[in-house]
Every structure is written in structure tokens, then in C-alpha cells.
């Protein structure tokens, strides 16, 4: 079943999705829609990439990690509660059926209303990357990857402020990610 | 005018061999993924293979692609299957059809097909 | 593989008739639902896919719903045009599978 991510209305929703390049800039399309993946591509399109550039996106959809190391994470900006729903996150490996499909729940909270602003950790400011915790076939790995200045204390400390969101699973087992080559 | 245009179809011996062609006109081929369904006489559709638009990804009924392989000439215009040791239960029409595409769609359905090709494979 | 069963096999039904045609798919399969018309020596044309977004030029008295596992193919008044093989095709696993067809004939 879909791994599923949390957001308020009015933040930015973050829908993490990674590939590892067989080799530096050798990039692999992908594509992300709105809707479980079909058999091929992805329905109701809302970004696409190619060997080179992103060739198709649509309003409020953007890649905020770099996409040419294979960081192909989703970020919706400023979500409604219409954009809850499954996203499909598809890696078009070449070759015979080698596609790899990632189909990602987001769940749409109301904003919550408070009487006076407080301190809120926003996760995607504090913690762009996911970890990259499961690899594909036989190149299983389990790294960390490319993370901002953070040690085990705050990864910890920012899993406990979002248990609520189920991203702290994630943390520990991200299924959108797969190693090529 | 979209034309999807098959031939190569015939009368092969079980573990022959045959090339079928499609010959696309009327529509930038290089943009749309491109499939092979195929119908048994008197019986229903059955798809076959499929290939992305640059031909780099390539799909198939897991029973025939050992035997079967789909490709593409963007340059030519043209849909290729090369058939490989025949079987009897081949035999049917075999059609060539684009995939539905426009930007934000997925090319899962298909809005075009071609005439058939019969393929009969007899002793 | 997923499981496309139509029904009914065949149908008789007279112009001016409204018809349903069911589909059924063996897991969900969401809204990844098509539907063909295929006359006798023709090919295959397309007539409603996601379900339920018609083909374009495909006459207002067809129409398409449902989602999930449950799906259905209407001709609200029948043509003599009308009278062909239907079949529908999931596109949410591989492979790609069709539903054994529904004949529709004139009564």
C-alpha cells in the first residue's frame, strides 16, 4: 500500500522520490502524476523530466532538490485540501519493463487555527532531503545520503514533532528510492 | 489524417519467422508511444507489446517476449515486431495503434489504430 | 494479471433503447478504464477512457462511470450505427488487459 505524507493547507507538501544515476548526469526520465501510476507513464501529468531538464510542469508542482543526482522529490507549493490523493512517482529505467513506480498518499490537514503564532518546524525547510533508507535489487543500501548539517539528535528530535505525520517511518523506510546501475 | 499502415503479415510455418511493419503518417510519430494488439479469430483483443517514444523502454505480455521483440524507426516513420518461433496459437490479426497523448495525459489508451495485419501460422 | 470481465456476452436491444454494458475488474483499478467499439472486419475505435471522458467525436449518447472494480458503459438511445462488439481495457496493470467483449445485436 502507498506510504503516506502529511500537510497543512496553505504549507507546501513534500513527496519524496529518488533514483541514483548509473553515472554522474546520466539522467533517467521521469515523471510524476496525480493518481496511482498506470502502466505506462503517469496519469494527469503534473511534471515531467528528461535525460536533461525538466520538459513539463504545471503551476504550484516543482522539483526543489537536484534532480541531476537524482533527487526527483515532489514539492507542492501552498497544498489545498483538493490536492490530497494519491501521486505517482515513476522512474523510466530503460530496457524491457524496467520502469520503477512509487505510488505516494498525501493527506491534506486543515490548517490548524491558533490564537497567537507559535514556534512550528516546517519540515521541508528543516529537512529538504528524505533519507534515502531502501535501495531496489541486489544494491540495497542504507545511507544517509545528501543531508544538510544535521545530526542523529535533531533527525530524532524532528521525528518526534512529525510522529504524528507518519514521516517519521519514513525515515526509516522510505520506499521511493532506487539505485540504477 | 492520422494513417497507421500494417504489413508482412502471411502464412508461416509453426517456428517461422515474420516481420510485421507499421507505416505512421499524418502525426509527429516521434511523440507518441506505440503498441501491438492482436485478435484470434472470432475472439476478443489481446495486447502485445508496447514501445515509448524513442524506443529506449519496451513492454511486453510476459509470455511472448521471449519471441517477440517491438522497435521503432522515428526516422522512417515505422513500428516494427519481429515474431520468432511461431506458434499456431499466433495466428490472429495483429493491429498497430498509437497511444492517446497530449502534455499532462498518459498514453495508455488508444486513439488510432490500424487496418490488421493477418498472421496464420500453419503447417 | 488483472481480470476484465464484461457483461452481458451479447445483447439484443432495438433502436431508441437505452443499454448498459458492465465491466468488472478483478482489483482496483481506479478510473484506469477504456472502452472500445469494434465493428465486424473493422478495427478497434476508441469511445470513453478514464473511465468516463469521451473520445472525441464520439456521440453525447454514450457515456461512461464508475471506478474501482465497478464500471459501465451506457448508450442512452440506440443507433443503428450502434450495433457492434464493445470492449473494455484496464491500463492500471501490467499487462494491459481487455475484457472478453460484449456483442451487441439488433433485435
Known amino acids: 500500500s502507498e506510504v503516506e505524507y502529511r500537510a497543512e493547507v496553505g504549507q507546501n507538501a513534500y513527496l519524496p522520490c529518488f533514483y541514483t544515476p548509473a553515472a554522474p548526469g546520466n539522467l533517467v526520465p521521469v515523471c510524476w502524476g496525480k493518481g496511482a501510476c498506470p502502466v505506462f507513464e503517469c496519469g494527469n501529468v503534473v511534471l515531467r523530466t528528461d535525460e536533461r531538464d525538466v520538459n513539463y510542469w504545471t503551476s504550484r508542482y516543482w522539483l526543489n532538490g537536484d534532480f541531476r543526482k537524482g533527487d526527483v522529490s515532489l514539492t507542492i507549493e501552498n497544498v489545498t485540501l483538493a490536492d490530497s490523493g494519491i501521486y505517482c512517482c515513476r522512474i523510466q529505467i530503460p530496457g524491457i519493463m524496467n520502469d520503477e513506480k512509487f505510488n505516494l498518499k498525501l493527506v491534506i490537514k486543515p490548517a490548524k487555527v491558533t490564537p497567537a503564532p507559535t514556534r512550528q518546524r516546517d519540515f521541508t525547510a528543516a529537512f529538504p532531503r528524505m533519507l534515502t533508507t531502501r535501495g531496489h535489487g541486489p544494491a540495497e543500501t542504507q545511507t544517509l545520503g545528501s543531508l544538510p548539517d544535521i545530526n542523529l539528535t535533531q533527525i530524532s528530535t524532528l521525528a518526534n514533532e512529525l510522529r504524528d505525520s507518519r514521516l517519521a517511518n519514513d525515515l526509516r523506510d522510505s520506499g521511493a528510492t532506487i539505485r540504477i546501475g | 489524417e492520422v494513417q497507421l499502415v500494417e504489413s508482412g503479415g502471411g502464412l508461416v510455418k509453426p517456428g517461422g519467422s515474420l516481420r510485421l511493419s507499421c507505416a505512421a503518417s499524418?502525426?509527429?510519430?516521434?511523440?507518441?508511444?506505440m503498441t501491438w494488439v492482436r485478435q484470434a479469430p472470432g475472439k476478443g483483443l489481446e495486447w502485445v507489446s508496447s514501445?515509448?517514444?524513442?524506443?529506449?523502454?519496451?513492454y511486453y505480455l510476459d509470455s511472448l517476449k521471449s519471441r517477440f521483440t517491438i522497435s521503432r524507426d522515428n526516422a522512417k516513420n515505422s513500428l516494427y515486431l519481429q515474431m520468432n518461433s511461431l506458434r499456431a496459437e499466433d495466428t490472429a490479426v495483429y493491429y498497430c495503434?498509437?497511444?492517446?497523448?497530449?502534455?499532462?495525459?498518459?498514453?495508455?489508451?488508444?486513439?488510432?489504430w490500424g487496418q490488421g495485419t493477418l498472421v496464420t501460422v500453419s503447417s | 494479471d488483472i481480470q476484465m470481465t464484461q457483461s452481458p456476452s451479447s445483447l439484443s436491444a432495438s433502436v431508441g433503447d437505452r443499454v448498459t454494458i458492465t465491466c468488472r475488474a478483478s482489483?482496483?483499478?481506479?478510473?484506469?478504464l477504456t472502452w472500445y467499439q469494434q465493428k465486424p472486419g473493422k478495427s478497434p475505435k476508441l469511445l470513453v477512457y478514464?473511465?468516463?471522458t469521451l473520445a472525441e467525436g464520439v456521440p453525447s449518447r454514450f457515456s461512461g462511470s464508475g471506478s474501482g472494480t465497478q464500471f459501465s458503459l451506457t448508450i442512452s438511445s440506440l443507433q443503428p450505427e450502434d450495433f457492434a462488439n464493445y470492449y473494455c481495457?484496464?491500463?492500471?496493470?501490467?499487462?494491459?488487459?481487455f475484457g472478453q467483449g460484449t456483442k451487441l445485436e439488433i433485435k
Open positions: 495503434a498509437r497511444g492517446y497523448y497530449y502534455y499532462g495525459s498518459s498514453p495508455n489508451y488508444f486513439d488510432y
Open positions: 481495457q484496464q491500463h492500471y496493470g501490467t499487462p494491459l488487459t
Open positions: 514501445i515509448n517514444y524513442d524506443g529506449r523502454n519496451t
Open positions: 478514464n473511465a468516463k
Open positions: 482489483e482496483n483499478i481506479y478510473s484506469y
Open positions: 499524418g502525426f509527429t510519430f516521434s511523440d507518441y508511444y
